[in-house]
Each structure stands twice: as structure tokens, then as C-alpha cells.
Amino acid sequence: MAVTACQGLGFVVSLIGIAGIIAATCMDQWSTQDLYNNPVTAVFNYQGLWRSCVRESSGFTECRGYFTLLGLPAMLQAVRALMIVGIVLGAIGLLVSIFALKCIRIGSMEDSAKANMTLTSGIMFIVSGLCAIAGVSVFANMLVTNFWMSTANMYTGMGGMVQTVQTRYTFGAALFVGWVAGGLTLIGGVMMCIACRGLAPEETNYKAVSYHASGHSVAYKPGGFKASTGFGSNTKNKKIYDGGARTEDEVQSYPSKHDYV
């Protein structure tokens, strides 16, 4: 019951997190005009990953897309890439985790398969969350760097007289949404990984039994394939639970109940 709850909660938390990552990626307010130097501005600027916007004194907001790809800063491209990778991984993770949910029965899917899928989705959520956090953090770092550079340049110029106050940008709402969403996705992923441990049936402790056949003694030892991926068992004729690594040419056909701890 606790396992199902952990898995379900992990799924819900990840779902909220990924929705947040998508929202953050689409939001226009990644950076907003810093009003400290000009609190009375009638023209408010803010920028997103895809377009920049200006809200004018009439209340009208004009947004213009970045219609160039090559002209954009490499850092912005990197942030876009990280966010998209995060969304894609998160979406795939959600798809996998739906089938992995213990409360949903799909044919005769065994617990080991569900455990395996839960682990896979958990890892995907963790990577997705990390991508989002990394993307937002890179953008935030870029903002901080630019902020202090523009502050340094603000009062320099011909004879110290500057007519144009350089617009500085500070953290927008999307950054906070992204950080929280990334964190939630990460937490959800960890919860899925924890649930995976409980989903796999307890390891059966077989007693060593010796079979005497043709003068050969083959011992069936307890515990097996602790490090395996669980998508199949050894179909060759050497049925020895040796707990070791398998060779690459071994065919994997059906999941083993004892592939997970």
C-alpha cells in the first residue's frame, strides 16, 4: 500500500513538475526590467526564451519573436535546448510511468516489469528535473552577469553624461516557476525510484540443493542477477544463477521475477 502511494505521489508530483517546466518554457517573463533605477517607467520590458515584450502606458503589450536562430546568444540556445530536453524526457517519463502504475493493470504485466518501468520513469524525471534546473540556473547566471555589467556601464560615457539609462534586467517569474517545477520533477523522480524498490517482490532465499546427474554436481545458488536490467533472463542452456554479469549475446526474452531487489 505504501509502495502504491509512493508511486502514485511520485507520478502526481512529477506531472505537476513537468507541467511547470512546460509553463516556464513558454512564459515570456524569464527576465523583467529592473525598476530600481527607473521605478516610474511607463514602458515595461520583459523577455522570454522565444520572444521579447514591451508593455506600454496604454496597457497594450507588444511581443516580438526572435525570428533569428543564428543571431541569438549561444547561452540562450543552450537554455532552450535544456528546457526542451527536460520536457521531452519528462513527457516520455510520464508515458512510461502511466503503464508502470501499480493501480493500473495492463494484461498480465508482472511486477518486475512494472518495477523496471517505474525505475526508468524515475530516472527520466530526475534527468528532466535536472535539465530544467540547469537551464533556469544558466539563464539566471547570464542575467546576473549582464546586470552587473550594465550597472558598471550605466554611468560611463562622454564626460560622464549619459542621456540613455541602460535597461537592466532582473529575474522574471518564469525562473522561479522553472526552479520549483524542476525541483518537483526531481522529487517525483526520486519517489518513483524509491517505489521501484518496493515494487519488486522480495528475493526468495532458495536453499542450496544438490542434484546428482551423470556424475556432475550443479549447484543452484540463491540470489541472482542483482545488477541485471530485468528485461529478460538467460535462455541459453546454462541455467546457473551466478549473480554475475551477462554476455552481450545473451538473448533476453521474458522478465524474471527475481531481477530486482
Partner: antibody, heavy 115, light 113 residues
Framework: QVQLVQSGAEVKKPGASVKVSCKAS????????VHWVKQAPGQGLEWIGY????????KYNEKFKGKATLTRDTSTSTVYMELSSLRSEDTAVYYC????????WGQGTLVTVSS | DIVMTQSPDSLAVSLGERATISCKSS????????????LTWYQQKPGQAPKLLIY???TRESGVPDRFSGSGSGTDFTLTISSLQAEDVAVYYC?????????FGGGTKVEIK
């Protein structure tokens, strides 16, 4: 078509208050701020402040704080400006204006303060 | 507050001649976000409400005759009427649309010589 229709002229005694209305039509009322401008007889234009009909947020020119109060009624797409403690120098034509770059102005409301 | 200074106060021009009005702001009206100058020009005829002529310092409002043109950037702006017509007799105002409080120039009265 877009229209901003203001209430009629008012004559008030010093110390009294007056409420001028501005009814908007022909556009989505909550999409644009409604600003108010004062024009004293034979004088130039002076910005009073604005109201955001979407969330009731207001901003005033420091000179008019305590003098003008802006409110709105979204059900009737109407903005109101109340001028309190009227004095002779408040005698002016008051305009409401809206849309991008204030493309549309009301016809103006003459408020006369006279004893 | 941004101070808008218009000159001259009044201007008498012959029909068909060019009229030029100057407007200076005490601070730059250039918005770095979109590289637009937030300066607006209005025309006010006697007994009427002001009418929008030009926004962003040089963009003509739809329906405004092309004899009206705006130019300038930063702090110095100009409104030009290339060939004055009788219906252009009015007071012209420039307005800071960049910073609160929004401020207007004192106005320039254009008359026919």
C-alpha cells in the same frame, strides 16, 4: 467603432466634489488602461493618472494625489474620476483617453468651480 | 519628471509652406527594449479634443495625411508639416510616453501667415 463618451458639464461650489464618468465602447474594456488629462482654460495638457480596468490598479501624478480618485465599473465599461475639495484652479476640461498611444479621447467634460 | 520643451510657442506659415516644430525632452525617450522613442505628437483644434498624429516619434497614425512627419531620437524631436493647409491650423503638443508622470510640451500654435 471605438468611443469614449463623457458625462456633461458640471458647475460646483468650492469645497464640493464632482464625479465625472467615461463610458467606453467598441473595444475590450479590460484590455487597455484609461487615462485622464486636465486642460485648464487656455492652458496646456496635464496628465492626472490612469486606472487599469482589468484589476483596478491605479497610478496618479503626484500633483493630483488626494485630489483625484479613479474607479471603474466593468459591468457598464465605465470609468469614474472623482475630484474632491474643489477650488477655482480645478476649473478645466477633463478628458479620458484610451487605446494604444491614446488614439481615442472623450469629448471632454468642463468642470467649473465658482462661488 | 521629464520636462518637455516645445519651440516656438507660435508659428505663422504661409499656405503650402513648410512648418517645423521642435520638442526637447530632459531625458532620453528611447526604450532599449524595442529601440523605439516613446514620443507622441497630438493636434488640437479649437473646441475639440486632441487627436493623435504621430507615435514612436516618427510613425504616422492611420488616416493622418502624409504631409505630417516626425523625426528625431533620444531627446530631440521634430514635427514637420511639409505643405501647410488651412485645416492644419491648430495647437500641436508633444508628449513623453516613456516615463510617469506622462508629460506634455507647452504646445505650439500654428497659424496661417
Amino acid at each position: 467603432q471605438v468611443q469614449l463618451v463623457q458625462s456633461g458639464a458640471e458647475v460646483k461650489k468650492p469645497g464640493a466634489s464632482v464625479k465625472v464618468s467615461c463610458k467606453a465602447s467598441g473595444y475590450t474594456f479590460t484590455n487597455y488602461f484609461v487615462h485622464w488629462v486636465k486642460q485648464a482654460p487656455g492652458q496646456g495638457l496635464e496628465w492626472i493618472g490612469y486606472i487599469n480596468p482589468y484589476n483596478d490598479d491605479t497610478k496618479y501624478n503626484e500633483k493630483f494625489k488626494g485630489k483625484a480618485t479613479l474607479t471603474r465599473d466593468t459591468s457598464t465599461s465605465t470609468v469614474y474620476m472623482e475630484l474632491s475639495s474643489l477650488r477655482s484652479e480645478d476649473t478645466a476640461v477633463y478628458y479620458c483617453l484610451s487605446l494604444r498611444f491614446f488614439a481615442y479621447w472623450g469629448q471632454g467634460t468642463l468642470v467649473t468651480v465658482s462661488s | 519628471d521629464i520636462v518637455m520643451t516645445q519651440s516656438p510657442d507660435s508659428l505663422a506659415v504661409s499656405l503650402g509652406e513648410r512648418a517645423t516644430i521642435s520638442c526637447k525632452s530632459s531625458q532620453s525617450l528611447l526604450n532599449s527594449g524595442n529601440q523605439k522613442n516613446y514620443l507622441t505628437w497630438y493636434q488640437q483644434k479649437p473646441g475639440q479634443a486632441p487627436k493623435l498624429l504621430i507615435y514612436w516619434a516618427s510613425t504616422r497614425e492611420s488616416g493622418v495625411p502624409d504631409r505630417f512627419s516626425g523625426s528625431g531620437s533620444g531627446t530631440d524631436f521634430t514635427l514637420t508639416i511639409s505643405s501647410l493647409q488651412a485645416e492644419d491650423v491648430a495647437v500641436y503638443y508633444c508628449q513623453n510616453d516613456y516615463s510617469y508622470p506622462l508629460t506634455f510640451g507647452g504646445g505650439t500654435k500654428v497659424e496661417i501667415k
